[in-house]
C-alpha cells in the first residue's frame, strides 16, 4: 500500500523521495508521474532528471531539494482538491530490472482559512529557462519564460517540518530512499 | 515514415545461439524504449525483453533473462536480442516493438512493430 | 506475474453488430491496460492505451473502457476490416502480460 502524505488546498504539498549517489554528481534519472508506477518509466510524467539537470517539468512541480545529493522530493505548488491521488517515484537505476519504484498517496484537505497575502521571490534562477526533452520526430527544444513565482509562505506543514533533520532522517528510514553503490 | 525490420532468425538446433537485429528508420531511435515480443505458431503474444533509449536499463521476462540479452547500438538505429541456449519453446516469430512515446508519457505500449522474424529450434 | 484473461476467446459476428470484448486482470492495474488488433501473418496494431485513449488514426468506432481488473474494447458497428485477432496488454506489473487473444470470425 502507498504512504499517505497530506496538505491543505492553497499550500505547497511535498512528497518526499531519496537516494544516495554512488559518488558526488554520479547522478540517476528519475521521473515523478500522477498516477501509480507503470512498468517502465512513470505515467503522465510530471518531472523527469536525467544524469546532470532537471530536463522536463510542468508548471506547479519541481524540486526544492538539492536533487543532485539525491534529494529527489516533489513539491507541488498552490495544490487543488484535483491534484490528490496516487504519484510515482521512480529512480532509474541502470541495469537490469534495477529501477526502485515508490508508490505515494497525496490526499488533499479542504483550506480551513484563507491564506494570508504572501511574499514572493523569482524562482527562474533555479533552473536553466532552456530544456531539452526527449520526444518524438526530431530532438525538440522547449524555450520557458519565466517561471511561476513560489510562494514562500504556502509550505505544507509536512515540508516545514521536513526541513527538521529529526523528520528528515525518520523519512529517510521508512524506506523512500535508495542508496547506490 | 516509421519502419522496423527484424532479420537474423531461422532454424537453429536445441542448445544453440542466434541473434536478432531490428533495423530502425524514420524517427529519433535513441528517443524510444524499444522492446521484444515473441509469438509462438498458433499462440498469444508474449513479451520478452526492452530496453531504455541509451541501453543503460533492460528489463526482462524472468524465465528468459539468463539466456536473452537486448541491446541497442543507438549510432547504428539498431536494437538486438542475442539468444543462447535456445530450446524448443523458444519458436516463435520474435517481433521487435517501439515503445510509445510522447512528453508527459510513459513507454509502456508499443505503437509500431515490425514484420517479425521467424525463429525455429529444431534438432 | 498479473494474469490477463480475456472473453470470449472466440467470437463470430456480422457485418454492422455491436461486439464487446472483455479483459479481466488478476489484481488492480488502474488503467495501465492497452488493446491490440492483429491480422493473420501480420504485426499486432495499437488500438487504445491506458484504457480508454484512441491510438492515432484508429477509427471511432473503436473504444475502450475501464479501470481497476475489468476492461473492455467496444466496437460500435463492426466493419469487414476488424475481423482479427484482438489482444490486451497490461503495463502496471512487471513482466508486461498479454491476454490470450479473442478472435473475432465473420458470422
Known amino acids: 500500500s502507498e504512504v499517505e502524505y497530506r496538505a491543505e488546498v492553497g499550500q505547497n504539498a511535498y512528497l518526499p523521495c531519496f537516494y544516495t549517489p554512488a559518488a558526488p554528481g554520479n547522478l540517476v534519472p528519475v521521473c515523478w508521474g500522477k498516477g501509480a508506477c507503470p512498468v517502465f518509466e512513470c505515467g503522465n510524467v510530471v518531472l523527469r532528471t536525467d544524469e546532470r539537470d532537471v530536463n522536463y517539468w510542468t508548471s506547479r512541480y519541481w524540486l526544492n531539494g538539492d536533487f543532485r545529493k539525491g534529494d529527489v522530493s516533489l513539491t507541488i505548488e498552490n495544490v487543488t482538491l484535483a491534484d490528490s491521488g496516487i504519484y510515482c517515484c521512480r529512480i532509474q537505476i541502470p541495469g537490469i530490472m534495477n529501477d526502485e519504484k515508490f508508490n505515494l498517496k497525496l490526499v488533499i484537505k479542504p483550506a480551513k482559512v484563507t491564506p494570508a497575502p504572501t511574499r514572493q521571490r523569482d524562482f527562474t534562477a533555479a533552473f536553466p529557462r532552456m530544456l531539452t526533452t526527449r520526444g518524438h520526430g526530431p530532438a525538440e527544444t522547449q524555450t520557458l519564460g519565466s517561471l511561476p513565482d513560489i510562494n514562500l509562505t504556502q509550505i505544507s506543514t509536512l515540508a516545514n517540518e521536513l526541513r527538521d533533520s529529526r523528520l528528515a532522517n525518520d523519512l529517510r528510514d521508512s524506506g523512500a530512499t535508495i542508496r547506490i553503490g | 515514415e516509421v519502419q522496423l525490420v527484424e532479420s537474423g532468425g531461422g532454424l537453429v538446433k536445441p542448445g544453440g545461439s542466434l541473434r536478432l537485429s531490428c533495423a530502425a528508420s524514420?524517427?529519433?531511435?535513441?528517443?524510444?524504449?524499444m522492446t521484444w515480443v515473441r509469438q509462438a505458431p498458433g499462440k498469444g503474444l508474449e513479451w520478452v525483453a526492452s530496453?531504455?533509449?541509451?541501453?543503460?536499463?533492460?528489463y526482462y521476462l524472468d524465465s528468459l533473462k539468463s539466456r536473452f540479452t537486448i541491446s541497442r547500438d543507438n549510432a547504428k538505429n539498431s536494437l538486438y536480442l542475442q539468444m543462447n541456449s535456445l530450446r524448443a519453446e523458444d519458436t516463435a516469430v520474435y517481433y521487435c516493438?517501439?515503445?510509445?512515446?510522447?512528453?508527459?508519457?510513459?513507454?509502456?505500449?508499443?505503437?509500431?512493430w515490425g514484420q517479425g522474424t521467424l525463429v525455429t529450434v529444431s534438432s | 506475474d498479473i494474469q490477463m484473461t480475456q472473453s470470449p476467446s472466440s467470437l463470430s459476428a456480422s457485418v454492422g453488430d455491436r461486439v464487446t470484448i472483455t479483459c479481466r486482470a488478476s489484481?488492480?492495474?488502474?488503467?495501465?491496460l492497452t488493446w491490440y488488433q492483429q491480422k493473420p501473418g501480420k504485426s499486432p496494431k495499437l488500438l487504445v492505451y491506458?484504457?480508454?485513449t484512441l491510438a492515432e488514426g484508429v477509427p471511432s468506432r473503436f473504444s475502450g473502457s475501464g479501470s481497476g481488473t475489468d476492461f473492455s474494447l467496444t466496437i460500435s458497428s463492426l466493419q469487414p476490416e476488424d475481423f482479427a485477432n484482438y489482444y490486451c496488454?497490461?503495463?502496471?506489473?512487471?513482466?508486461?502480460?498479454f491476454g490470450q487473444g479473442t478472435k473475432l470470425e465473420i458470422k
Open positions: 524514420g524517427f529519433t531511435f535513441s528517443d524510444y524504449y
Open positions: 489484481e488492480n492495474i488502474y488503467s495501465y
Open positions: 496488454q497490461q503495463h502496471y506489473g512487471t513482466p508486461l502480460t
Open positions: 530496453i531504455n533509449y541509451d541501453g543503460r536499463n533492460t
Open positions: 491506458n484504457a480508454k
Open positions: 516493438a517501439r515503445g510509445y512515446y510522447y512528453y508527459g508519457s510513459s513507454p509502456n505500449y508499443f505503437d509500431y
